[in-house]
């Protein structure tokens, strides 16, 4: 049994880091493998993660962490029984994938303005809380070409757009994702999408 693709890990910079790897053949990850991880700290102890299958030869493990600070570094040991298959390390702050925003809501009752709001996925005491920026994706269910991205570079988790920038009388969907420049993170997953019917009063034409 050998590791074909070494574990790569990303952290949500809160409580979970996810490591993925591939074996050289079909593997029952949960019965055959264990990933041991330990914070490099005098008084820490090793924790065991039981991996799950992620495709035939792929495995994924969700490492639980109390919290994360920038200095944290973890040692990782991948075991098959008594055999050490791979040894490595992981610094969560250097491999951050933020949590996805939640509770995306479209408020359509604000005088021809669409107000999109969502929730910051982090509690206020987490470092990322004040460092997230967002991308909002809006698309038409009827017209695949009607697809747009709005970059929200301020901290407030909301976006206002004129309803008239979208076509009237058709349904749209929106979703939002986050990233943090401070840690050069990857983008989060998209939030679940929300749907609304776009309708607004056309202004009277001037003759």
């Amino acid at each position: 049994m050998k590791v074909l693709q070494e574990p790569t890990c990303v952290s949500d910079y809160m409580s979970i880091s996810t490591c993925e790897w591939k074996m050289n053949g079909p593997t029952n990850c949960s019965t055959e493998l264990r990933l041991l991880y330990q914070l490099v700290f005098l008084l820490s102890e090793a924790h065991t993660c039981i991996p799950e299958n992620n495709g035939g030869a792929g495995c994924v493990c969700h490492l639980l962490m109390d919290d994360v600070v920038s200095a944290d570094n973890y040692t990782l040991d991948l075991w098959a029984g008594q055999q050490l298959l791979w040894k490595g390390s992981f610094k969560p702050s250097e491999h951050v994938k933020p949590r996805a925003p939640g509770n995306l809501t479209v408020h359509t009752n604000v005088s021809d303005t669409l107000l999109l709001t969502w929730s910051n996925p982090y509690p206020p005491d987490n470092y990322l809380y004040n460092h997230l920026t967002y991308a909002v994706n809006i698309w038409s269910e009827n017209d695949p070409a009607d697809f747009r991205i709005y970059n929200v570079t301020y901290l407030e988790p909301s976006l206002r757009i004129a309803a008239s920038t979208l076509k009237s009388g058709i349904s749209y969907r929106a979703r939002v994702r986050a990233w943090a420049q401070c840690y050069n993170t990857t983008w989060s997953e998209w939030s679940p999408s929300t749907k609304w019917h776009n309708s607004y009063r056309e202004p009277f034409e001037q003759h």
Epitope: L42, L43, V69
Partner: antibody, heavy 116, light 111 residues
Framework: EVQLLESGGGLVQPGGSLRLSCAAS????????MAWVRQAPGKGLEWVSA????????YYADSVKGRFTISRDNSKNTLYLQMNSLRAEDTAVYYC?????????WGQGTLVTVSS | QSVLTQPPSASGTPGQRVTISCSGS????????FNWYQQLPGTAPKLLIY???HRPSGVPDRFSGSKSGTSASLAISGLRSEDEADYYC???????????LGGGTKLTVLG
């Protein structure tokens, strides 16, 4: 609410022994390393000993090595410090502290006086 | 003799910004993070800053920490009379397998 309550302090003669206890509540005791820190009257803080969450890792300051023994009973949520061959310079308030990278919660301390 | 050196005293007037330093000796290992503790008169110490610059919940943002090599500093802005206390720095010394603490700095708020 995290609470740490030390007990077992008192007056002891040089060469004598004392056992300190620290009762923990308000958190999952078995998931945290613990430590003892002391403060002699009018002096600064001095780390004494620390123990990992399972008790497998144990560390001591040079000044107490071979005389003091730290231990824990996770089923009773209690930390202990067995102090033998006590000296006058061990006189101090002894604080129990929870470890999360640093000493993030402290007890109110128990006074140990070593005097003849 | 402490491995971490702090000034024995510091002072400032209300509203001022005060900085307390904590220096490791030249041979002090550069690996560990610094922590800061506040001890108000007659009370147990309280964690103020951990992992160089992180504040536990409940600690006002007037308190901030930074690290440079084997030294660290604690800054207190908008000084208040209730900040009068002893302040200690500490770090895990992996070469000694021990926790080392500075000698403490007594902060006096004048006026």
């Amino acid at each position: 609410e995290v609470q740490l309550l030390e007990s077992g302090g008192g007056l002891v003669q040089p060469g004598g022994s004392l056992r300190l206890s620290c009762a923990a509540s308000g958190f999952t005791f078995s998931r945290h390393a613990m430590a003892w820190v002391r403060q002699a009257p009018g002096k600064g803080l001095e780390w004494v000993s620390a123990i990992t969450m399972s008790g497998r890792g144990i560390y001591y300051a040079d000044s107490v090595k071979g005389r003091f023994t730290i231990s824990r009973d996770n089923s009773k949520n209690t930390l202990y410090l067995q102090m033998n061959s006590l000296r006058a310079e061990d006189t101090a308030v002894y604080y129990c502290a929870r470890v999360h990278r640093a000493f993030d919660y402290w007890g109110q301390g128990t006074l140990v006086t070593v005097s003849s | 003799q402490s491995v971490l050196t702090q000034p024995p005293s510091a002072s400032g007037t209300p509203g001022q910004r005060v900085t307390i330093s904590c220096s490791g000796s030249p041979l002090f290992p550069d690996s560990g993070s610094f922590n800061w503790y506040q001890q108000l008169p007659g009370t147990a110490p309280k964690l103020l800053i951990y992992a160089d610059s992180h504040r536990p919940s409940g600690v006002p943002d007037r308190f901030s920490g930074s690290k440079s090599g084997t030294s660290a500093s604690l800054a207190i802005s908008g000084l208040r009379s209730e900040d009068e206390a002893d302040y200690y720095c500490g770090t895990w010394d992996y070469s000694l397998s021990a926790y080392v603490l500075g000698g403490g700095t007594k902060l006096t708020v004048l006026g």
